[in-house]
């Protein structure tokens, strides 16, 4: 028997770009709490029941209100350790899930609302009685720093908390063959009752004469390491060296959902659909009935008629999820069209429309030309919700109200001189060029690249452009 202890040091934005928005605001103050779930063994597919080593919930942290404009700092944490007592031997290898939850304290109907802010998971080796192990885990843009240890509860001692200590029978020393129980030097090890030769490091017993192995060890005396598969290479194509065919990547490969949960891929990861009675990211939280009060936010718990339906939460308006743990963000219904920004105001949805669009759902493409005349013979052109006038020659500006200098763009090629004219512009071409813009060279033999000039006009004469 013993206790696994978890100390959270900090929870805040991780390094690098994309700092997360503060989870709390002046309008919606909140506080954090943590949940830890422990499973024995390193294998994620282990058949043990969920949180078989135990689970614990922290106290609520101090209330936090974001300072406007300030980046999200490390958030204030609950006091004290999270302690998970374990009754049997400490397995030496274990899997953990640490969840950071946010409790919103605004004017909630039906009390505060909880939402999962971050979840980290890992697999570790740890001997009981050792020093604190430090760890840093990242979940999205958040970073969690924590320490953990496993310690045995007297009279148990040892790396697996399987050796027992008893008070000394004599004041000065322990009995024959028995050592003092460090660090309890005034106690002695109880006589070993395991099978003779049972590995003291990798085996333990709960009944006289038996030898049970810790994760990763096998054999009658727990002295043989479990041979690992030769296919421990990362996901990818088959390895010529091992001859293993490793499946291609897929978040649902090997079904990460426990307890009969079904896995479906999402664009970012995967989602487990849990049988009723189980919940959590991987359906790892189990055995819940209405007596456990699994429905958050005032959800009504109804017991199911069969084991597949241990309970169901009927959520009050504004909440969803199998435990009513999620606030319904009606913007997830994607109600706004044409790139409009969705705002869920609680009592109503609002769409903030991009320029050129209107309507409660930004569904109307504004006819920008309606009621907007372009002056001086210009014509209105629509495009992407933006209004534009195509102006007649000699005019410019947004509404064609400005008289344009037709020569401003230097339209006459090859050194031709431009003259503004009431009907447009005239180019006086340099010798050797002709055309409305002086764009055509006159051939040396006098022939033009164009059809012959109209009667009365010689190459080099000003060409009026109408």
């Amino acid at each position: 028997a013993g206790v696994f202890e978890l100390q959270i040091h900090s929870f805040g934005p991780g390094p690098g770009p994309g700092a997360p928005r503060s989870p709390c605001s002046a309008r919606l103050p909140c506080r954090l709490f943590f949940r830890v779930c422990l499973k024995p063994g390193l294998s994620e597919e282990a058949a043990e029941s969920p949180c078989a080593l135990g689970a614990a919930l922290s106290a609520r942290g101090p209330v936090y209100t974001e300072q406007p404009g300030a980046p999200a700092p490390d958030l204030p944490l609950p006091d004290g350790l999270l302690q998970v007592p374990f009754r049997d031997a400490w397995p030496g290898t274990f899997s953990f899930i640490i969840e950071t939850w946010r409790e919103e304290l605004g004017d909630q109907i039906g009390g505060p609302a909880w939402s999962l802010l971050a979840r980290v998971a890992g697999r570790r080796r740890l001997a009981a009685g050792g020093p604190w192990a430090r760890d840093i885990q990242r979940a999205g843009a958040w970073e969690l720093r924590f320490s953990y240890r496993a310690r045995c509860e007297p009279p148990a001692v040892g790396t697996a908390c399987t050796r027992l200590c008893r008070p000394r029978s004599a004041p000065s020393r322990c009995g024959p063959g028995l050592r003092p129980c460090a660090p309890l030097e005034d106690e002695c090890e109880a006589p070993l009752v395991c099978r003779a030769g049972c590995s003291p490091e990798h085996g333990f017993c709960e009944q006289p004469g038996e030898c049970r192995c810790l994760e990763g060890w096998t054999g009658p005396l727990c002295t043989v390491p479990v041979s690992t598969s030769s296919c421990l290479s990362p996901r990818g194509p088959s390895s010529a060296t091992t001859g293993c065919l490793v499946p291609g990547p897929g978040p649902c490969d090997g079904n990460p959902c426990a307890n009969g949960g079904s896995c479906s891929e999402t664009p970012r990861s995967f989602e487990c659909t849990c049988p009723r009675g189980f919940y959590g990211l991987r359906c790892e939280v189990s055995g819940v009935t209405c007596a456990d009060g699994p429905c958050f936010n005032g959800g009504l718990c109804v017991g199911g008629a069969d084991p597949d339906s241990a309970y169901i939460c009927h959520c009050p308006p504004g909440f969803q999820g199998s435990n009513c743990e999620k606030r319904v963000d009606r913007c997830s219904l994607q109600p706004c069209r044409n790139g409009g920004l969705c705002l869920d105001l609680g009592h109503a949805l609002r769409c903030r429309c991009r320029a050129g669009f209107a309507g409660p759902r930004c569904e109307h493409d504004l006819d920008d030309c309606a009621g907007r005349a372009c002056a001086n013979g210009g014509t209105c052109v629509e495009g992407g919700g933006a209004h534009r006038c195509s102006c007649a020659l000699g005019f410019g500006g947004r509404d064609c109200r400005e008289r344009a200098d037709p020569c401003a763009a230097r339209p006459c090629a090859h050194g031709g001189r431009c003259y503004a004219h009431f009907s447009g512009l005239v180019c006086a071409c340099a010798p050797g060029y002709m055309g409305a813009r002086c764009e055509f060279p006159v051939h040396p033999d006098g022939a033009s690249a164009l059809p012959a000039a109209p009667p009365g006009l010689r190459p080099g004469d000003p060409q009026r452009y109408l």
């Epitope: 664009p267 970012r268 969803q320 997830s332 994607q334 706004c336 409660p360 759902r361 569904e363």
Partner: antibody, heavy 117, light 107 residues
């Protein structure tokens, strides 16, 4: 034009799993949430929930929590409905429908699922 | 949940008639009321959204009205192709709910 085409009819035994597909075309798939509606034989329409096609996050009506899962294959503009541990009362026609901000404006033709031992 | 009630489960009318189908909500839902048509072959189409707006491609003989908790769908000049079951649906509060349907038949 806008179309939602669903997979064909399914005949299953109790306890089995079924996965229905809904392939969208004629619009940008990730701009509109996809909804699922159940119609038991001779009965009315019952809204099951939706999936946000941009994030993949689903939302389920109370009666469809647990054995039902909505998912996406965005690259194929396809939404899926999976029903696990089928029961006789899951016998129904299931529709997918696009939501335009006001209503479910385009519907699939429906997929009939029959659960019988 | 908002309950939607279509008191008339079936209705007989003659071609050319003006037909009104009603729908009542258990609570006010801000005009987020839609009407759908389900043909005998099972296909479902949106007719009217947001109480009175006609969906694109729907004939103008269909119209919707109402407010608060009472809403109605009107077909001004019944045609043979209108033989179907009509469902109302509220889209204001989750979960969305449908009326039980009104089956329209020809006399």
């Amino acid at each position: 034009q806008i179309q939602l085409v669903q997979s064909g009819p399914e005949l299953k035994k109790p306890g089995e799993t079924v996965k229905i597909s809904c392939k969208a075309s004629g619009y940008t798939f990730t701009d509109y949430s996809m909804h699922w509606v159940k119609q038991a034989p001779g009965k009315g329409l019952k809204w099951m929930g939706w999936i946000n096609t941009e994030t993949g996050e689903p939302g389920y009506a109370d009666d469809f929590k647990g054995r039902f899962a909505f998912s996406l294959e965005t690259s194929a503009s396809t939404a899926y409905l999976q029903i696990n541990n089928l029961k006789n009362e899951d016998t129904a026609t299931y529709f997918c429908a696009r939501y335009d901000g006001y209503a479910m404006d385009y519907w699939g033709q429906g997929t009939s699922v029959t659960v019988s031992s | 949940d908002i309950q939607m009630t279509q008191t008339t489960s079936s209705l007989s009318a003659s071609l050319g008639d003006r037909v009104t189908i009603s729908c009542r909500a258990s609570q006010d839902h801000s005009n987020h009321l839609n009407w759908y048509q389900q043909k005998p072959d099972g296909t479902v189409k949106l007719l009217i959204y947001y109480t009175s707006r006609l969906h694109s491609g729907v004939p103008s003989r269909f119209s919707g009205s109402g407010s608060g908790t009472d809403y109605s769908l009107t077909i001004s000049n019944l045609e043979l192709e209108d033989i179907a079951t009509y469902f109302c649906q509220q889209g204001d509060m989750l979960p969305w709910t449908f009326g039980g349907g009104t089956k329209l038949e020809i006399k």
